[in-house]
Interface confidence: low
């Protein structure tokens, strides 16, 4: 037959342990009930009475089953560069994360301690690596045949358009300008949100297919002189 179910408080068997959601009280030398999340121990157990739990006060919390005498204080309100992604409740701490356009430069156990604005790549530079929740944008100079004319933390270098006749050759910070006749489109017109139609690179840069290997297909990679050094990253 199974052993009789013990109700808290009770003395554990010699060398035994207390059950789930119970703790061993050294003073009473008994197994006593823990308090559920959102509560704390108002009165500790004795040999004859179990733990008395009480709700956490405003702006305090307990996230786990516990026997703490006081609830933990919620973290301070989120700063202006943060958004509150989890509110302070009796059962969970406030969590602040960086708002869009920012990343976490110094994290803490939950959420972020210090946010920093994502780097913006200046004209002539494109985003080489996107910013993430915990890392900054990396900028790189636009390769020959590509350009970026914006200061942006999201824009990447885009190919110059192809012209029947080039009025002004493109450079790292400007698209090619065509004469009044429409530019040639060997590919589909660009996305409507872009200031210039995106196509392949300008005529004056001969695109060369990278060596193809099954099953990968490469993009057209430009050849030609490198642009003058303009610094490794944009600000």
């Amino acid at each position: 037959l199974p052993a009789q179910v013990a109700f808290t408080p009770y003395a554990p068997e010699p060398g035994g342990t207390c059950r789930l959601r119970e703790y061993y009280d050294q003073t009473a030398q008994m197994c006593c009930s823990k308090c559920p999340p959102g509560q704390h121990a108002k009165v500790f157990c004795t040999k004859t009475s179990d733990t008395v739990c009480d709700s956490c006060e405003d702006s305090t919390y307990t996230q786990l089953w516990n026997w703490v005498p006081e609830c933990l204080s919620c973290g301070s309100r989120c700063s202006s560069d943060q958004v509150e992604t989890q509110a302070c409740t009796r059962e969970q701490n406030r969590i602040c994360t960086c708002r869009p356009g920012w990343y976490c430069a110094l994290s803490k156990q939950e959420g972020c301690r210090l946010c920093a604005q994502l780097r913006k790549c200046r004209p002539g530079f494109g985003v080489a690596r996107p910013g993430t929740e915990t890392s900054d944008v990396v900028c790189k100079p636009c390769a020959p045949g590509t350009f970026s004319n914006t200061t942006s933390s999201t824009d990447i270098c885009r190919p110059h358009q192809i012209c029947h006749v080039v009025a002004i050759p493109g450079n790292a910070s400007m698209d090619a300008v065509c004469t009044s006749t429409s530019p040639t489109r060997s590919m589909a017109p660009g996305a409507v949100h872009l200031p210039q139609p995106v196509s392949t690179r300008s005529q004056h840069t001969q695109p060369t297919p990278a060596p193809s290997t099954a099953p990968g297909t490469s993009f057209l990679l430009p050849v030609g002189p490198s642009p003058p050094a303009e610094g490794s990253t944009g600000d």
Epitope: P130, T154, D155, I156, A188, G190, A191
Partner: antibody
Framework: EVQLQESGPGLVAPSQSLSITCTVS????????VHWVRQPPGKGLEWLVV???????TYNSALKSRLSISKDNSKSQVFLKMNSLQTDDTAMYYC?????????????WGQGTTVTVSS | DIVLTQSPSLMSASPGEKVTMTCSAS?????MYWYQQKPRSSPKPWIY???NLASGVPARFSGSGSGTSYSLTISSMEVEDAATYYC?????????FGSGTKLEIK
């Protein structure tokens, strides 16, 4: 000629860890990033992690606690380790080169290595 | 995470027919990328920066869209175009893929 070749154990027992190597040729890991992408049988693609040319990493947050990526530039190898495998981790695992010319695409892919999680 | 929803998940087209498949993002992305995958093969880059064809991709393919709505179009379906097409975004990590559109030949 750009090539990527994955190699792995094939069969992994549940709760065990997985180690896969991607050996590349035709380009340098100091100039290009490498991604890991997986595809369960009959299902779609899931991006896992990338190690960038400078050694920086970006993980899929849903799997970050179980994933680890590293590389040896001199050996032209990228390593993926995944812990606590379950049956739903059974998939084809691909490594792919990150097109670092600013187009943000995986321009060359390996053939993939099949990983089966089973006891 | 940005969720990419592709529709339809399965479609069939006759040779010569015009085909359009869409990719809808749960929040705005700057550009969309497309990959083609055939059975027992690795994915291949197909369209980058929303509308640019990867080398070797036939001119009958085109891509367009902005914000949360993107599409891939084949002006005239050919047998070799039967494959699964995946969209992908790089605007926010994790760099998610769509669930794919499987295009079959009628």
């Amino acid at each position: 000629e750009v090539q990527l070749q994955e190699s792995g154990p094939g069969l992994v027992a549940p709760s065990q860890s997985l180690s896969i190597t991607c050996t590349v040729s035709g380009f340098s890991l100091t100039s290009y990033g490498v991604h890991w992408v997986r595809q369960p049988p009959g299902k779609g693609l899931e991006w896992l992690v990338v190690i960038w040319s400078d050694g920086g990493t970006t993980y899929n947050s849903a799997l970050k606690s179980r994933l680890s990526i590293s590389k040896d530039n001199s050996k032209s190898q990228v390593f993926l380790k995944m812990n606590s495998l379950q049956t739903d981790d059974t998939a084809m695992y691909y490594c792919a080169r990150h097109d670092d010319d600013g187009y943000y695409a995986m321009d060359y892919w390996g053939q993939g290595t099949t990983v089966t999680v089973s006891s | 995470d940005i969720v990419l929803t592709q529709s339809p998940s399965l479609m069939s087209a006759s040779p010569g027919e015009k085909v359009t498949m869409t990719c809808s993002a749960s929040s705005s992305v700057g550009y969309m990328y497309w990959y083609q995958q055939k059975p027992r093969s690795s994915p291949k880059p197909w369209i980058y920066l929303t509308s640019n064809l990867a080398s070797g991709v036939p001119a009958r393919f085109s891509g367009s869209g902005s914000g949360t709505s993107y599409s891939l179009t084949i002006s005239s379906m050919e047998v070799e175009d039967a494959a699964t097409y995946y969209c992908q975004q790089w605007s926010s990590d994790p760099f998610t893929f769509g669930s794919g559109t499987k295009l079959e030949i009628k």
